[in-house]
């Protein structure tokens, strides 16, 4: 019997994986090193897939190798001494200059360079740079970028306001419809802020005498109704209103006179007025009752070549006349005339002229007050400095308002450098059918009186005082205000402006940048303004948009139900 050879020679086991080989009777047994398996230890055990030791016990990456394995870490982590667990590298602590001027924030396996809102990180310069949101078309109309943010603006002068999303624009809507019906039979005397509304020339037989009859309606207390003069300017007659009463001034080769008389007729009612030249006097009648008789030695206007030539001007006079008046008068008159008969010639073609011109037509119904149609402004130059007052300048304002649209600038002070150091505006509230009153210094809102029902039949009354130290609201309302510290900063801006030149604007803003104020829409509605105890008369303005009515306000469009005519009782003028 032959001897059975050693089964371990030649070696049947996998050299890499075996630990020992044991010879048996016609067989062999390979004992494997850890990490190997199989009859010949030829198979590597994948420790990373061992269900009894998940992921080989590695916290992150398990790398299987022939007969073994090892753990490794993802980028941004380091291996702990146990060779299994990974720890996050805090790059921010390790390299403090990683983010330059930005804030380094450690995140698992990495880091982030953080910038404040409105800024973004520039990898190249390792700094935070302002995001120009305006270049990303964030706003519907106008966008102003500033460090760390942006603001959208809408063209209020074209009737737009910023929508609630603070990006898009929407039309400023009517909150109180007004009766803007006009009639061409009614001649509006205040069509022009400066200038004559109508000019007529009469050539009549020499036996003619001057006469004028008309119905007249106004709330204005002063102004020129009509002015008549001879062709050579040597004689003239002025029919005006002063202190609400009829005034007549006349001058010719024989005499020079001024007379005021009769009842006050600026009551908003139609009054029939007649001025007639008699042989020895001029007779003035109101409602067919004589109120004045002015003696005259000869004819008012001297005929020439068998003709009496007369020029008649409505609501004004030629510029050169101003210096010739016996008593100066502000010619501006907000009123209406109808049923006129001049020089006994009836309406004689005037109606045809007026019919074509919408802006010469008068409103059918008006109330006392001033009306801002949302298309222009009035400018005043007011001295707010009070020599006797230790505080220096002061602004005491009373506003009586009846808005027709819920957004617009009511009052603004504008500096010579086109900033708006003070403004009082109306803004449609976020709560439906109500408005906020906003007081601003430049483009910062310093006071907000929220959710008032201002669009109502009744007028609302608002009163406040401002000086360099304080803003005091005298109307008992809930106010949302900025911090006292911030208020002082803003009042300091106002104080600086008040030491220079400021112009006062009513009803809106002149041409200043959109971004100069939080609101830039024109005010639409009725408003009376009292500043430092003086009731502002729009006829006395430095300039005024022709559409603003100085002494007449359209009536509210009559609704069948007055359910929406509730006004905050605290705002009703108690006077």
């Amino acid at each position: 019997v032959n001897a059975i050879p050693d089964q371990c020679s030649p070696l049947p086991c996998n050299e890499d994986g075996y630990m020992s080989c044991k010879d048996g009777k016609a067989s062999f047994t390979c004992t494997c090193k850890p990490g190997w398996q199989g009859e010949k230890c030829e198979f590597d055990i994948n420790e990373c897939k061992d269900p009894s030791n998940i992921n080989g016990g590695c916290s992150q990456i398990c790398d299987n190798t022939p007969g073994s394995y090892h753990c490794s870490c993802k980028s941004g982590f380091v291996m702990l001494s146990n060779k299994k667990d990974c720890k996050d590298v805090d790059e921010c602590s390790l390299k403090p200059n990683m983010c330059g001027t930005a804030v380094c924030k450690n995140i698992p396996g990495d880091f982030e360079c953080e910038c404040p809102e409105g800024y973004r990180y520039n990898l190249k310069s390792k700094s935070c740079e302002d995001v120009d949101e305006c270049s990303e078309n964030m706003c519907a109309q106008l966008c102003v970028n500033y460090p760390g943010g942006y603001t959208c603006y809408c063209d209020g002068k074209k009737g737009f306001k910023l929508a609630q999303d603070q990006k898009s624009c929407e039309a400023v809507s009517v909150c109180l419809p007004l009766n803007l019906d006009t009639k061409y039979e009614l001649l509006y005397l205040a069509e022009q802020f400066a200038g004559v509304v109508l000019y007529l020339k009469f050539r009549l037989p020499e036996i003619s005498r001057f006469s004028a009859e008309f119905d007249f309606r106004t709330y204005d207390s002063q102004g020129v109704i009509l002015y008549a003069e001879s062709i050579d300017h040597s004689a003239w007659l002025l029919i005006a209103l002063r202190g609400g009463k009829i005034e007549v001034q006349l001058k010719n080769e024989h005499t020079s006179k001024i007379t005021t008389g009769g009842d006050i007729i600026n009551n908003g009612l139609w009054n029939m007025v007649s001025v007639e030249e008699l042989e020895h006097s001029i007779s003035i009648k109101i409602a067919k009752e004589a109120v004045m008789d002015i003696n005259k030695p000869g004819p008012l206007f001297k005929p020439e070549n068998g003709l009496l030539e007369t020029k008649v001007y409505f609501a004004g006079f030629p510029r050169k006349v101003e210096s010739e008046l016996i008593k100066p008068i502000n010619p501006r008159l907000d009123g209406c005339i109808r049923s006129w008969n001049l020089m006994k010639q009836g309406a004689s073609g005037i109606k045809e002229i007026i019919q074509e011109k919408q802006n010469k037509h008068c409103l059918v119904t008006v109330e006392k007050g001033s009306y801002y149609p949302g298309s222009g402004i009035a400018e005043f130059h007011i001295d707010y400095n009070n020599g006797s007052n230790a505080e220096g300048w002061h602004i005491n304002v009373t506003l009586n308002i009846r808005p027709s649209m819920g957004t617009g600038v009511m009052l603004a002070l504008v500096s010579s450098n086109n900033t708006v150091p003070f403004a009082v505006s109306l803004v449609d509230s976020t709560s439906e059918k109500s408005q906020d009153i906003v007081i601003s210094v430049e483009n910062t809102v310093i006071y907000r009186i929220q959710a008032l029902s201002l669009c109502s039949n009744q007028r609302s009354h608002l009163e406040f005082r401002v000086n360099r130290n304080n803003l005091e609201l005298l109307t008992p309302l809930k106010i949302e205000t900025i911090s006292q510290e911030e208020l002082q900063t803003q009042l300091a801006i106002l104080d600086k402006a008040m030491k220079g030149k400021v112009a006062t604007y009513l009803g809106g803003l002149p041409d200043v940048p959109f971004s100069a104020t939080p609101v830039n829409a024109f005010y639409n509605g009725c408003m009376e303004v009292n500043i430092n105890g003086v009731e502002l008369d729009l006829d006395e303005a430095i300039s005024k948009h022709n559409d603003i009515r100085a002494h007449s306000c359209p009536s509210v469009w009559k609704k069948t139900k007055n359910s929406e005519d509730q006004v905050d009782p605290r705002l009703i003028d108690g006077k």
């Epitope: 390299k95 990683m98 990898l123 190249k124 390792k126 700094s127 270049s135």
Partner: antibody, heavy 117, light 106 residues
Framework: QVTLKESGPGILQPSQTLSLTCSFS??????????VSWIRQPSGKGLEWLAH???????RYNPSLKSRLTISRDTSSNQVFLKITSVDTADTATYYC?????????WGQGTTLTVSS | QIVLTQSPAIMSASPGEKVTMTCSAS?????MYWYQQKPGSSPRILIY???NLASGVPVRFSGSGSGTSYSLTISRMEAEDAATYYC?????????FGAGTKLELK
């Protein structure tokens, strides 16, 4: 006037270490906002960014090559260096250094490396 | 890493024609750069920080875009504009380039 010029060995054998130098003038790498990058471009192919060194000596690397790359600088001699270990044929390319800074961005003309056994 | 995809890969245009090429990013980027490369030359910077024209670059070149979508426009193609154009993002590391758009003269 800003100029950058790259220099290198031209030819290397696989597994050798590549040493590149970028010599520049017209600016100082110690000025805030300045930085120099290395970029390479295999012939007829696209551009690949390798590494960047900032004015404050902060360094950034392309993760896919990080273990083989070292960027450094010598501000006194106006030079930036790049070392790539264990090169192989895939590293054959034109290597550019580029200035990214406050005054604009400028690239050198490039230096060509061929890895061949 | 942010992947930049340029399209088209190749295009041709006649002199005077308006040319627009795009660069799309796999995630939002803040700063995009555009380079022009002609055979045998190193890349030349055209546009930095998305829309700023680099010094000495003709005004017919303009860049625009935001987020993940960017474009380079040549208002009127000229013969010398025939080249390969690359976009590059400078928003996060690793810095990456697009594969390029080759613009040929028709």
């Amino acid at each position: 006037q800003v100029t950058l010029k790259e220099s290198g060995p031209g030819i290397l054998q696989p597994s050798q270490t590549l040493s590149l130098t970028c010599s520049f003038s017209g600016f100082s790498l110690s000025t805030s906002g300045m930085g120099v990058s290395w970029i390479r471009q295999p012939s007829g192919k696209g551009l690949e960014w390798l590494a960047h060194i900032y004015w404050d000596d902060d360094k950034r690397y392309n993760p896919s090559l990080k273990s083989r790359l070292t960027i450094s600088r010598d501000t006194s001699s106006n030079q930036v260096f790049l070392k790539i270990t264990s090169v192989d044929t895939a590293d054959t390319a034109t290597y550019y250094c580029a200035l990214y800074g406050n005054y604009g961005d400028y690239w050198g003309q490039g230096t060509t490396l061929t890895v061949s056994s | 890493q942010i992947v930049l995809t340029q399209s088209p890969a190749i295009m041709s245009a006649s002199p005077g024609e308006k040319v627009t090429m795009t660069c799309s990013a796999s995630s939002s980027v803040s700063y995009m750069y555009w380079y022009q490369q002609k055979p045998g030359s190193s890349p030349r910077i055209l546009i930095y920080d998305t829309s700023n024209l680099a010094s000495g670059v003709p005004v017919r070149f303009s860049g625009s875009g935001s987020g993940t979508s960017y474009s380079l426009t040549i208002s009127r193609m000229e013969a010398e504009d025939a080249a390969t154009y690359y976009c590059q993002q400078w928003s996060s590391y690793p810095l990456t380039f697009g594969a390029g758009t080759k613009l040929e003269l028709k």
